[in-house]
Interface confidence: medium
């Protein structure tokens, strides 16, 4: 299963499969997740070790048993790969590191005014993997405001040094934020020239392209099909790069297929897994296990659940079958790809889905309406559960926010539907940041069912909660993921670090905002809240948030949106933006529906016919 806990002051002994320099434990964990054999990692921050060579060391580890002995090491951080962790799997890393210089090959230098602009330049440069920026207070005047774009053979820094007034970070291309755009075309009977960065075996060009997309130095590829004239080169996928970023030449060649990495695609990247099953094909590799199962799909599921399994072959040979079950060979290799691919067999083969991020796994997202006043712009993928509920009558307009809690479920406020109970007038937009990006061609979800709490009454503040069942399930992406729900009876007073988001008014008599706004707001006790709203009853099923002095709040248009808080290392949906006296007024906190109080109701309503809860819960 998915293991998310980190071990502080602990280092895993042995099992090393790779090592590199990373700026923090989270980036180290991401590299472990995408490494074909890494199950565990240990990271040494600068403060944990005097040995300069080992500072910022990230050690990727494998273990036949899935665990390794932990030794005490002050400052070290260890943990697990996020393989099998569904929507938590992402190669996107947004953090900027202050006082740190990430070294690599400096191939471009320019003057910019901010570190954000430097990161944007890196994201928009095809070869840039990471960058360093010298601030205006850097000790050497001639280097101030320099933005250095960098790459390295492995995609990670060749060294990391502590250096004052320098800020570093990574390209946001894996966040699907590149402005470059990508070539989706696959070119039949064409071979690309230039430098080979890696060679793997794949069953088709599409798997080759996905591997290229997630390889740090692959910009384009050539695949040799299973009927290529040279037998030893059949099914070979050559991952390639060039100085210019594009192939310097291409040659017409029968039975070859070429194409480009999709890392520079905007808004959508392929999943880092391969779900197709290949009938009549055997994948060779190191044997992990052999088990009898009923059908190739069960074989794939078995491989996915066994964390070390990378690919499988399901044999239909009579000697490999008994009754309705046949042998499922679970296999692995050094690079995650088969060591041999054979055609015309009585087997079917495929890959583990452990890196797929659409899985309905049970582990919570670990990131981080009436209206948002005093907030700041959000960035792409920062609040991937936030949705915009829009109404299309003669014109189309944003009315409310909502929170994605499962593939087919959105949680919002009941009052959003006051006077608009018809489901066919609603359009739900997910995975968006700017309302102005919505055009007639932008995909949206339609409503299958609106479930308003049975005790909600129009123009009353109580039970302001509603569920929306979407007509079709949504896939999870970098920008579209669910938020976890709390446990029943969670005490809101013990939450800290809470945020409200939405496109609502930025002042009381304002207008809907274009860019999704965010604001950090402290929770207020119900007793304190009741004092501020003496004409209303603040019930235990509500939670309040706001600053005594006002100035930051939700506002009109934020209703139904999320109030999320970090709780014991995980993010949870604590409240639904409901009501308040004006916006951001002094001593007038915002009032939110307390989600923990409605957990029974949510689970009852989201139960599918097979009794499985269809929302994102942490259990």
């Amino acid at each position: 299963g998915c293991l998310t806990q980190l071990y502080e002051n602990a280092f895993f002994r042995g099992g090393d499969v790779a090592s590199m320099y990373t700026p923090n434990a989270q980036y180290c964990q991401m590299r472990c997740t995408f490494h074909p054999r890494c199950l565990l990692f240990s990271f040494l921050p600068a403060s944990s070790i005097n040995d300069m060579e080992k500072r910022f060391g990230c050690f990727l580890k494998d273990s036949v048993t899935g665990t390794l002995p932990k030794v005490h090491r002050t400052g070290a951080v260890s943990g697990h790969s996020l393989k099998q962790c569904g929507h938590q799997i992402s190669a996107c890393h947004r953090d900027i590191y202050k006082g740190v210089d990430m070294r690599g090959v400096n191939f471009n230098v320019s003057k910019v005014s901010s570190v954000e602009e430097c990161q944007k330049r890196c994201t928009s440069n095809i070869r840039c993997q990471f960058f360093s920026y010298a601030t205006q207070t850097f000790h050497k005047a001639e280097y101030r405001n320099n933005c250095l774009l960098k790459y390295s053979p492995g995609g990670t820094p060749t060294a990391i040094k502590v250096l004052s007034n320098v800020e570093s970070g990574f390209s946001l291309k894996p966040c699907a934020l590149s402005e470059i755009g990508c070539h989706m075309n696959i070119f039949q009977h064409l071979a690309f020239s230039d430098v080979d960065v890696a060679r793997v075996l794949t069953p088709d060009a599409f798997v080759c392209r996905t591997i290229c997309t997630y390889h740090p130095n692959c910009l384009f590829f050539t695949f040799y099909t299973n009927v290529w004239k040279i037998e030893s080169q059949r099914n070979v996928c050559l991952l390639k790069t060039s100085e210019s970023g594009t192939p310097s030449s291409s040659t017409p060649q029968e039975n070859t297929i070429s194409g480009y990495s999709l890392l520079t695609c905007k808004r959508t990247l392929p999943e880092p897994c391969h779900s197709k099953i290949y009938p009549g094909v055997d994948f060779g590799g190191e044997e992990l296990n052999v088990t009898f199962v009923k059908g190739v799909n069960v074989c794939q599921e078995t491989c996915t659940k066994m964390i070390r399994c990378q690919f499988f072959t399901y044999s239909l040979l009579p000697e490999d079958c008994k009754e309705e079950k046949c042998k499922c060979f679970l296999r692995l290799s050094m690079d995650g790809s088969p060591t041999r691919i054979a055609y015309g067999t009585q087997g079917s083969s495929g890959y583990s889905l452990r890196l797929c991020n659409t899985g309905d796994n049970s582990v919570c997202t670990t990131k981080t309406s009436t209206r948002i006043v005093g907030g700041t712009n959000s960035s792409w993928g920062e609040w991937p559960w936030q949705v915009s509920l829009q109404v299309k009558l003669t014109a189309q307009r944003h009315l409310c926010g909502g929170s994605l809690i499962g593939h087919q479920w959105v949680l919002t406020a009941a009052h959003c539907f006051d006077g608009l109970p018809l489901q066919d007038v609603w359009r739900i937009y997910s995975g968006i940041l700017n309302l102005s990006d919505i055009t007639k061609d932008t995909p949206f979800s339609q409503i299958k069912e609106i479930i308003i709490h049975q005790n909600y009454k129009v123009s009353e503040g109580n039970h302001d909660i509603a569920l929306i069942k979407l007509q079709a399930p949504l896939n999870y992406t970098e920008f579209q993921k669910p938020i976890c729900l709390p446990s029943k009876g969670d005490t809101s007073t013990i939450y800290t670090n809470c945020w409200v988001t939405g496109w609502g008014f930025s002042k009381e008599k304002g207008e809907i905002q274009n860019i999704l706004q965010k604001v950090n707001i402290p929770l207020v006790t119900n007793e304190e809240c009741q004092k501020r709203y003496q004409d209303y009853k603040i019930t235990q099923r509500m939670v309040c948030a706001g600053y005594k002095e006002g100035g930051k709040d939700a506002c009109k248009g934020d209703s139904g949106g999320p109030l999320v808080c970090k709780h014991n290392g995980m993010w949870r949906l604590v409240g639904i933006t409901s009501w308040g006296e004006g916006c951001a007024r002094r001593e007038q906190p915002g009032v939110y529906t307390k989600v923990a109080e409605y957990m029974d109701w949510i689970l009852e309503k989201t139960q599918s016919s097979d009794g499985k809860a269809q929302m994102q819960s942490p259990a």
Epitope: C2, E8, S492, T493, I494, T496, A613
Partner: antibody, heavy 117, light 107 residues
Framework: QVQLQQSGAELMRPGASVKVSCKAL????????MHWVKQTPVLGLEWIGA????????AYNQKFKGKAIFTADKSSRTAYMYLSSLTSEDSAVYYC??????????WGQGTLVTVSA | DIQMTQSPSSVSASVGDRVTITCKAS??????LAWYQQKPGKAPKLLIS???GLEAGVPSRFSGSGSGTDFTLTISSLQPEDFATYYC?????????FGQGTKVEIK
């Protein structure tokens, strides 16, 4: 690694009060709740409640309201549980425990409180 | 409050035996269940949770299953270090509550 160090055993008279301490090491004290659990041979493990050192917020099991009070000192990274009006029914081992998510992943070694005339 | 009922209260077994402990909740707890092991004079140790499954460092001979109100802890092949008391705990609804414990002793 995460460690929770509890104060030593206490022998108390009925009607007295006791303060049990729990020092947190190896993680950011203000980011995680500290929970308290009581263990007796008869009733087994019982959840008393929790404090969030970052916000000062508390949650109590109704059964222990008025009996237990939680506090936390950020500077010393220590959580305290104050038990008042002690009776023989309060004789137990008391544990502080820190969750990851919700389950209790880390435990102190326990503090034995004995109430006897 | 949700009541957690464990059975049996004790079990005698030998090294290599398969041991099964059950835990029944008085209402649906939506898989929010944890299992702990406790040895005499020591604090409980988290073995399995609904959130992350088997805890790091816990041998794979321990496994948890069940849903709704009925849950099971299985030790596939009992080892000498497994003789201890096992508790289940629900964290679906406050107050969090524990089962009364199952003592696994040497036959």
């Amino acid at each position: 690694q995460v460690q929770l160090q509890q104060s030593g055993a206490e022998l108390m008279r009925p009607g007295a009060s006791v303060k049990v301490s729990c020092k947190a090491l190896g993680y950011t004290f203000t980011d995680y709740e500290m929970h308290w659990v009581k263990q007796t041979p008869v009733l087994g493990l019982e959840w008393i409640g929790a404090i969030h050192p970052g916000s000062g917020g508390t949650a109590y099991n109704q059964k222990f309201k008025g009996k237990a009070i939680f506090t936390a000192d950020k500077s010393s990274r220590t959580a305290y549980m104050y038990l008042s009006s002690l009776t023989s029914e309060d004789s137990a081992v008391y544990y502080c425990t820190r969750p990851y998510g919700y389950p209790f992943a880390y435990w102190g070694q326990g503090t034995l409180v004995t109430v006897s005339a | 409050d949700i009541q957690m009922t464990q059975s049996p209260s004790s079990v005698s077994a030998s090294v290599g035996d398969r041991v099964t402990i059950t835990c029944k909740a008085s209402e649906d707890i939506y898989n929010r269940l944890a299992w702990y092991q406790q040895k005499p004079g020591k604090a409980p140790k988290l073995l399995i949770s609904g959130e992350t499954g088997l805890e790091a460092g816990v041998p794979s001979r321990f496994s948890g299953s069940g849903s709704g109100t009925d849950f099971t802890l299985t030790i596939s092949s009992l080892q000498p270090e497994d003789f201890a008391t096992y508790y289940c705990q629900q964290y679906w609804s406050t107050p969090w509550t524990f089962g009364q414990g199952t003592k696994v002793e040497i036959k």
